[in-house]
């Protein structure tokens, strides 16, 4: 009778084991072990027992002891069970960002590991078990579906293998995959709201505001604002689940025309975009052209109003005929035209919006000098010793210099309060002089003597 010890062994992969083969007869013809494993016989006294060291045990094996005794041949098997933890425990790669409400499939793959009967695969969220299944197949695969929730944000998902050899007197061997950190997000289906000027004048600044609410986590949202190829640098303010991005946009002559303004919000692996057109225009103030800004009385003056080729102008409130960017009027300069304003108003329609500009020029009319009865009376009669103010106003542009002299030497104090004396009586020659010429006028002062009764 052949016997083997131990009859059952659990050992780590690549390990060694001592197996004793024994026989019940004293003088066996033959006693040995049959195994593909490397073996080394340890020398022992006696003929009915042999000890073998079996090494580099890589897989389950059933070495067989045999003996040949006079009463016949017999065999005995020992059962070697190899254990080893999996070589690979991995969660199938997933995008780290997942939208809330999506069904997320977690897939764990386990390569290797034995004995499989003692190997379990566990899927976890943090420390919470989601699914536990025995490892089946090579590689073993365990899947579970998770409905992504907002509160899953930042949660770690992992896969753990448990090789439980406690019933065999060994321990529980655990292997854990690298964690998958879930980033959950909510990006609403509504595009961001974009508020900006529809039209913008070159060399000016405009303000663009892009906003969106219903976002989670709002701090992770990326906002891209651009006008054409010009990337804008917004200041972003965040609310609980909203943001508002405000940017200044400066435009130059090179930007003229219709430009695309875009606001893109990127969160997770999704984006929402809003497009708007902004028309960049150039509209210099209209020009008021006077043939000469300063003319003499009686001169013919042409006033021209010229604006942007697509503008419509009015000159002093009168529309151009035909409707367009140019208007003009002709006038013969009179003293009343001195200081007259000529206003050119231009309206430019840009993308349906009306833009208004104007410019005003003043005409200077040179005239005079003038001395007339109304402003410089020819006769004054004043009582002696009364207080009087001689008045004589010369008109003209430029304002004439006025002198009133009696006998070429004695001046009349124009505009000053004087006490009337006999010396004041007489005829004065008032002379008004300017660059435009000279006029004279005789003024007579009569002094009434008081009557003595």
């Amino acid at each position: 009778q052949t016997s083997v010890s131990p009859s059952k062994v659990i050992l780590p992969r690549g390990g060694s084991v001592l197996v004793t083969c024994s026989t019940s007869c004293d003088q066996p013809k033959l006693l040995g072990i049959e195994t593909p494993l490397p073996k080394k016989e340890l020398l022992l006294p006696g003929n009915n027992r042999k000890v073998y060291e079996l090494s580099n045990v890589q897989e389950d094996s059933q070495p067989m002891c045999y003996s040949n005794c006079p009463d016949g041949q017999s065999t005995a098997k020992t059962f070697l069970t190899v254990y080893w933890t999996p070589e690979r425990v991995e969660l199938a790669p997933l995008p780290s960002w997942q939208p809330v409400g999506k069904n997320l499939t977690l897939r764990c793959q386990v390569e290797g590991g034995a004995p499989r009967a003692n190997l379990t695969v566990v899927l976890l969220r943090g420390e919470k078990e989601l699914k536990r299944e025995p490892a089946v197949g090579e590689p073993a695969e365990v899947t579970t579906t998770v409905l992504v929730r907002r509160d899953h944000h930042g949660a770690n998902f992992s896969c753990r293998t448990e090789l439980d050899l406690r019933p065999q007197g060994l321990e529980l061997f655990e292997n854990t995959s690298a964690p998958y950190q879930l980033q959950t997000f909510v990006l609403p289906a509504t595009p961001p709201q974009l508020v900006s000027p529809r039209v913008l004048e070159v060399d000016t600044q405009g303000t663009v505001v892009c906003s969106l609410d219903g976002l989670f986590p709002v701090s992770e949202a990326q906002v891209h604002l651009a006008l054409g190829d010009q990337r804008l640098n917004p200041t972003v303010t965040y609310g609980n689940d909203s943001f508002s991005a405000k940017a200044s946009v400066s435009v130059t002559a090179e930007d003229e025309g219709t430009q695309r303004l875009t606001c893109a919000v990127i969160l997770g692996n999704q984006s929402q975009e809003t497009l708007q057109t902004v028309t960049i225009y150039s509209f210099p103030a209209p020009n008021v052209i006077l043939t000469k800004p300063e003319v003499s009385e009686g001169t013919e003056v042409t006033v021209k109003c010229e604006a942007h080729p697509r503008a419509k102008v009015t000159l002093n409130g009168v529309p151009a005929q035909p409707l367009g960017p140019r208007a003009q009027l002709l006038l013969k300069a009179t003293p009343e035209d001195n200081g007259r304003s000529f206003s050119c108003s231009a309206t430019l329609e840009v993308a349906g919006q009306l833009i208004h500009k104007n410019q005003t020029r003043e005409l200077r009319v040179l005239y005079g000098p003038r001395l007339d009865e109304r402003d410089c009376p020819g006769n004054w009669t004043w009582p002696e010793n009364s207080q009087q103010t001689p008045m004589c106003q010369a008109w003209g542009n430029p304002l004439p210099e006025l002198k009133c002299l009696k006998d070429g030497t004695f001046p009349l104090p124009i505009g000053e309060s004087v006490t009337v004396t006999r010396d004041l009586e007489g005829t004065y020659l008032c002379r008004a002089r300017s660059t435009q010429g000279e006029v004279t006028r005789k003024v007579t002062v009569n002094v009434l003597s008081p009557r003595y009764e």
């Epitope: 009015t314 002093n316 529309p319 035909p322 309206t347 009306l354 104007n358």
Partner: antibody, heavy 122, light 110 residues
Framework: QSVEESGGRLVTPGTPLTLTCTVS????????MSWVRQAPGKGLEWIGI?????STYYASWAKGRFTISKTSTTVDLSITSPTTEDTATYFC???????????????????WGPGTLVTVSA | AYDMTQTPASVEVAVGGTVTIKCQAS??????LSWFHQKPGQPPKRLIY???TLASGVSSRFKGSGSGTQFTLTISGVESADAATYYC????????????FGGGTEVVVK
């Protein structure tokens, strides 16, 4: 000075229709013209405008559904593919004025036609 | 876009009374605002332009005021003939996608 719409009639959904606005007493080369519609029992709804030079602008809901064009004395409104929601009275209005104080032009519907009724029904 | 908000949607007034209709623009339109009224089966008729200027042939009982974004139409000494729907209209822009008219105010005269 007057404007008058014509071409309104009963059409089946999807049948293209063109309305015409005929002007007299002023030149279309000096004015912008707008089309406005009014569904039964509803308010005034601006459809679009054509400028003195022929540029056109449309309300967002009207883009692609309507086309405005003009000749020297008429302004046309084409309804590409009418639906029952397009049942309304369609008005043509002169939409351009100027302020003699500032000298600026502005949009103002100072002259209206009597309107033409379009009924879209299967 | 220039949105025009008109209030109230409907108002009842006794003959001889006063009625006030407000129109608010979402952005400044300076003084480029007109008021119209419309009676059933008729085209709109312009009452006021440039916010406060009375159109020719319109009774001085109609008064327009305001500038920028807030405008008011006041009808004093209301007559039965004033029963109509009143609309404001901005004259600042006809850009693509623009709103031109307010929603309208129905004036019912008792």
């Amino acid at each position: 000075q007057s404007v008058e719409e014509s071409g309104g009639r009963l059409v089946t959904p999807g049948t293209p229709l063109t309305l015409t606005c005929t002007v007299s007493g002023f030149s279309l080369s000096n004015y912008y013209m707008s089309w406005v519609r009014q569904a039964p029992g509803k308010g005034l709804e601006w459809i679009g405008i054509i400028s003195d030079s022929g540029s056109t602008y449309y309300a967002s809901w009207a883009k692609g559904r309507f086309t405005i064009s003009k000749t020297s004395t008429t302004v046309d409104l084409s309804i590409t593919s009418p639906t029952t929601e397009d049942t309304a009275t369609y008005f043509c209005a002169r939409d351009w004025s100027y302020d003699s104080t500032s000298g600026y032009y502005y949009y103002d519907m100072d002259l209206w036609g009597p309107g033409t009724l379009v009924t879209v029904s299967a | 876009a220039y949105d025009m908000t008109q209030t109230p949607a409907s108002v009842e007034v006794a003959v001889g009374g006063t009625v006030t209709i407000k129109c608010q623009a979402s952005q400044s339109i300076n003084s480029w605002l007109s008021w119209f009224h419309q009676k059933p089966g008729q085209p709109p008729k312009r009452l006021i332009y440039k916010a406060s200027t009375l159109a020719s042939g319109v009774s001085s009982r109609f008064k327009g005021s305001g500038s920028g974004t807030q405008f008011t139409l006041t009808i004093s000494g209301v007559e039965s003939a004033d029963a109509a729907t009143y609309y404001c209209q901005q004259g600042y822009s006809r850009s693509d996608g623009e709103h031109v008219f307010g929603g309208g105010t129905e004036v019912v005269v008792k």
